[in-house]
């Protein structure tokens, strides 16, 4: 009763197509698969960024897999062949592992890479990234930004840099078609006459860095003697009403300050008969139903009402 063995996949490699972190893992079928012609061979693939505690595990029948990685760190992957139990009259048979690693050969001391990279997707319309130059770099250093997301056939360079003293310190992106809810990859590299500059890689999803415009048209009506209804409108732009969460800051008679979070464009407030004046501001953010994260908008303009005037309107 001979033991059934299977070879690992051949030519396992990690290929960088130039998409700034989106890599291809590819391989060829193992040698000597003739004995298992009737079998559907599967592959178990494990991969991670070096330094990560956990492996991502994929079982596939394909000869390739694609995923995003942090190119600031190395990547390691391993794969083995799986023969399902149907092929072996018993238990599943696994080959030994084939292994592959990949990293961008660095240049430049780490301090030369850009500092404090910050990207904001204003009102889900305009992406702007800004950074500070690396520590100790001279004014002859210039940084260049490249970006890619699925849908572009190659990485593109920024065409509209924000400059200070001739040095690129940010990028205004053009309209980015179908770019949300997918990984957006950025590389900022640099050049200098005096020293090599370290590249930096960043990955995020645009819907998670949206900063909306503040709400507009703040109004206030007295619903009953001790109830005031605050209302506002969603800001102009592509963000649907269902995607907003709001924070309201209410001040009664310059003393009591109430901050509360609501999910729609109204808020009913209980007041006392001592209340003379009411002021409020609102800001907006993309909610958890539309993104995993977001940035609060600026506060709206402050609106104030005399409660006595509101009461007169109500009585009329």
């Amino acid at each position: 009763d001979t033991e059934i063995k299977v070879n690992p996949p051949q030519d396992f490699e990690i290929v960088d197509p130039g998409y700034l972190g989106y890599l291809y893992l590819q391989w060829q079928p193992p040698l000597s698969l003739d004995n298992f012609k009737e079998c559907t061979v599967e592959y178990e693939l494990k991969y991670r960024n070096i330094g990560s505690e956990t492996w991502t595990t994929i079982i596939t029948k394909n000869l390739h897999y694609k995923d995003g990685f942090d190119l600031n760190k190395g990547i390691e992957a391993k794969i083995h062949t799986l023969l399902p139990w149907q092929c072996t009259n018993g238990s599943e048979v696994q080959s030994s592992w084939a292994e592959a690693t990949y990293w961008i050969s660095p240049q430049g001391i780490p301090e030369t890479k850009v500092q404090d990279m910050d990207c904001v997707y204003y009102n889900w319309q305009y992406l702007l990234c800004s950074w500070k130059p690396g520590i100790g770099v001279l004014l002859d250093t210039n940084y260049n930004l490249f970006y890619w997301y699925e849908g572009l056939d190659r990485a593109l360079q920024c065409v509209d840099y924000i400059k200070v003293d001739g040095q690129n310190i940010g990028c205004r992106f053009p309209y980015l078609e179908s770019s949300d809810y997918k990984d957006f990859y950025i590389c900022v590299n640099g050049s200098s006459e005096t020293k090599p500059i370290r590249s930096s890689y960043f990955t995020f999803q645009l819907q998670n860095i949206v900063k909306p415009l503040p709400p507009v048209c703040l109004t206030c009506t007295q619903e009953s003697l001790y109830e005031i209804k605050l209302k506002w409108s969603i800001p102009l732009g592509p963000i649907p009403a269902r995607c907003f969460v709001y924070e309201i800051e209410i001040r009664e008679d310059d003393t009591t300050l109430v901050t509360t979070t609501v999910e729609n464009e109204t808020y009913t407030l209980k007041i006392t008969n001592e209340t003379r004046q009411l002021c409020f501001v609102v800001r907006s953010k993309v909610n958890i139903y539309c993104s995993d994260d977001g940035i609060w908008s600026e506060w709206s303009d402050k609106q104030c009402w005399e409660v006595e005037e509101l009461l007169k309107k109500t009585l009329l």
């Epitope: 330094g51 050969s105 240049q107 430049g108 001391i109 780490p110 301090e111 020293k195 090599p196």
Partner: antibody, heavy 116, light 108 residues
Framework: QVQLKESGPGLVAPSQSLSINCTVS????????VHWIRQSPGKGLEWLGV???????DYNSALMSRLTISKDNNKSQVFLKMNSLQSDDSAMYYC??????????WGQGTSVTVSS | QVVLTQSPAIMSASPGERVTMTCTAS???????LHWYHQKPGSSPKLWIY???NLASGVPARFSGSGSGTSYSLTISSMEAEDAATYYC?????????FGSGTKLELK
């Protein structure tokens, strides 16, 4: 397996220049950078510079005017040249492989004495 | 440049004893770029702990490293004779790259 081996003149006269070769095996200079470090009782471990895999170079600014680091990828060799040597340049000179922002393999070092 | 100050300069420990040595940086250094090297007389330095707390290949599990910002340390949970050596901290964050002056650990 990964190896680095320095070879130098041993003795150098004051004001003369120093040339040291670092011959590597077990890895490619197109994938890994190589650092030069020296060690003396007076100054401890002192980083001199690095030749990156892509061909660019970083130097210790205090020594930059006297240093040149070059390499030959095909011969798997990295070269250190230092001009105008003085007695305080006497040290053990090491080359070391750069790997993920650390120096993971070092050569055995070559001793350099500056004396007339 | 970043000056790394190691203390103590020399220390001795008995087998089984817990040993801690420190490295203080004059400027903040990212923990990713703070490493420790081990050197015995007549040998070249060996990478011992990388990125503050990761043991290099072949380093016994009794070694550990910790720290952040300007303060880092290397600890041996239970001293063994073979641990007698000089230990250097090294920062790879800012140019020029610098090393501490070393802590010489002797067997008592």
């Amino acid at each position: 397996q990964v190896q680095l081996k320095e070879s130098g003149p041993g003795l150098v006269a004051p004001s003369q220049s120093l040339s040291i070769n670092c011959t590597v095996s077990g890895f490619s200079l197109t994938k890994y950078g190589v650092h030069w470090i020296r060690q003396s009782p007076g100054k401890g471990l002192e980083w001199l510079g690095v030749k990156w895999a892509g061909g660019s170079t970083d130097y210790n600014s205090a020594l930059m005017s006297r240093l040149t680091i070059s390499k030959d990828n095909n011969k798997s060799q990295v070269f250190l040249k230092m001009n105008s040597l003085q007695s305080d340049d006497s040290a053990m000179y090491y080359c070391a492989r750069d790997h993920r922002d650390a120096m993971d393999y070092w050569g055995q070092g070559t001793s350099v004495t500056v004396s007339s | 440049q970043v000056v790394l100050t190691q203390s103590p300069a020399i220390m001795s420990a008995s087998p089984g004893e817990r040993v801690t040595m420190t490295c203080t940086a004059s400027l903040s250094v990212s923990s990713t770029y703070l490493h420790w090297y081990h050197q015995k007389p007549g040998s070249s330095p060996k990478l011992w702990i990388y990125s503050t707390s990761n043991l290099a290949s072949g380093v016994p599990a009794r070694f550990s490293g910790s720290g952040s910002g300007t303060s880092y340390s290397l600890t041996i949970s239970s001293m063994e004779a073979e641990d007698a050596a000089t230990y250097y901290c090294h920062q790879y964050h800012r140019s020029p790259l610098t090393f501490g002056s070393g802590t010489k650990l002797e067997l008592k």
